[in-house]
Interface confidence: low
């Protein structure tokens, strides 16, 4: 299946963070999506055998990226209060 | 057909810079990764990182971190590379290549560039 | 990284024969592993990738066997313009790694 790595994290505002996403075996498309509270489930990112292929609602202070292994990286930088969310990596083929 | 041409050799002393492009044309030139790779006289070839087409986000082997930029000219299908204050172990060929798009395990490359010679030397 | 040997370094024959060529990697790669052709002032040419399977256009005369850590690149009638460098790389993690050559010369 789809391994998320840390599985919590407590930081402070203003830093930066790294959430991991391996796919499942063969799966070469990766998405990220942001749940939160008050905005509710929304579509971030989508990367495709280590190429953006869609943008949804993420900030710029947010980045990804696909490695050729097809694991990715999503970067949250000068976080704020309102970045408390949960962050989901989903993949398909 | 699917090409790869990249500019001609380059004569520079060391602490000068250099950048070298790679032109591609016979497909749609971001659906697919461009690689640099370095081959040194006499040796092997040596993988230095790649740059994603579509969004120009590059990515760097640990050795070339640094002094080694990868860009792009999207509009006219070209892949840069350029190197700051040069040394002499940068005298070598680079090539460009295209990584073919089979996902997992796809770190290859199907079609190159001739490569081109840049002498360092003072 | 995983590190590619490859042998010979260097092999003479003549055309017609057929030669092999062996690669050797520092850890299983599985059958991920692709052979290149070298020549001067020529773009690189894909060979083999996945160890075994043939890139369009390459003459059937070539062909790759192997999995795990180890693999052979066969050219079997060898034809003139068959000669120059081979490499292995392997193509099954980050980064993408390469053998250090083998010169097939003209005997």
């Known amino acids: 299946g789809v391994t998320q790595t840390p599985k919590h994290l407590i930081t402070a505002t203003g830093q930066r963070v790294t959430l991991r996403c391996s796919p499942r075996s063969g799966d070469l498309s990766v998405y990220w999506y942001q749940q939160s509270l008050d905005q509710g489930l929304q579509f971030l990112i989508h990367y495709y055998n280590g190429e953006e292929r869609a943008k949804g609602n993420i900030l710029e202070r947010f980045s990804a990226q696909q490695f050729p292994d097809l694991h990715s990286e999503l970067n949250l930088s000068s976080l704020e209060l309102g970045d408390s969310a949960l962050y989901f990596c989903a993949s398909s083929v | 057909q699917i090409q790869l041409v990249q500019s001609g050799p380059e004569l520079r002393e060391p602490g000068e810079s250099v950048k070298l492009s790679c032109k591609a044309s016979?497909?749609?030139?971001?659906?697919?990764?461009v690689h640099w790779v370095k081959q040194a006289p006499g040796k092997g070839l040596k993988w230095m990182g790649w740059?994603?087409?579509?969004?120009?986000?590059?990515t760097y082997a640990d050795d070339f971190e640094g002094r080694f930029v990868f860009s792009l000219e999207a509009s006219a299908s070209t892949a840069n590379l350029q190197i700051s204050n040069l040394k002499n172990e940068d005298t070598a060929t680079y090539f460009c290549?295209?990584?073919?798009?089979?996902?997992?395990?796809?770190?290859?490359?199907?079609?190159w560039g001739q490569g081109v010679f840049v002498t360092v030397s003072s | 990284d995983v590190q590619m040997t490859q042998s010979p370094y260097n092999l003479a024959a003549s055309p017609g024969e057929s030669v092999s060529i062996n690669c050797k990697a520092s850890?299983?790669?599985?059958?991920?592993l692709a052979w290149y052709q070298q020549k001067p002032g020529k773009p690189n040419k894909l060979l083999i990738y996945?160890?075994?399977t043939l890139q369009s256009g390459i003459p059937s005369r070539f062909s790759g066997s192997g999995s795990g850590t180890d693999f052979t690149l066969t050219i079997r009638g060898l034809e003139p313009e068959d000669f120059g460098l081979y490499y292995c790389?392997?193509?099954?993690?980050?980064?993408?790694?390469f053998g250090a050559g083998t010169k097939l010369e003209l005997k």
């Open positions: 290549a295209r990584s073919w798009r089979r996902g997992l395990r796809g770190i290859g490359f199907d079609y």
């Open positions: 740059i994603n087409t579509y969004t120009g986000t590059p």
């Open positions: 996945d160890g075994s």
């Open positions: 850890k299983s790669i599985n059958k991920y």
């Open positions: 790389q392997q193509h099954n993690e980050y980064p993408p790694t």
């Open positions: 016979g497909y749609t030139f971001t659906d697919y990764l």
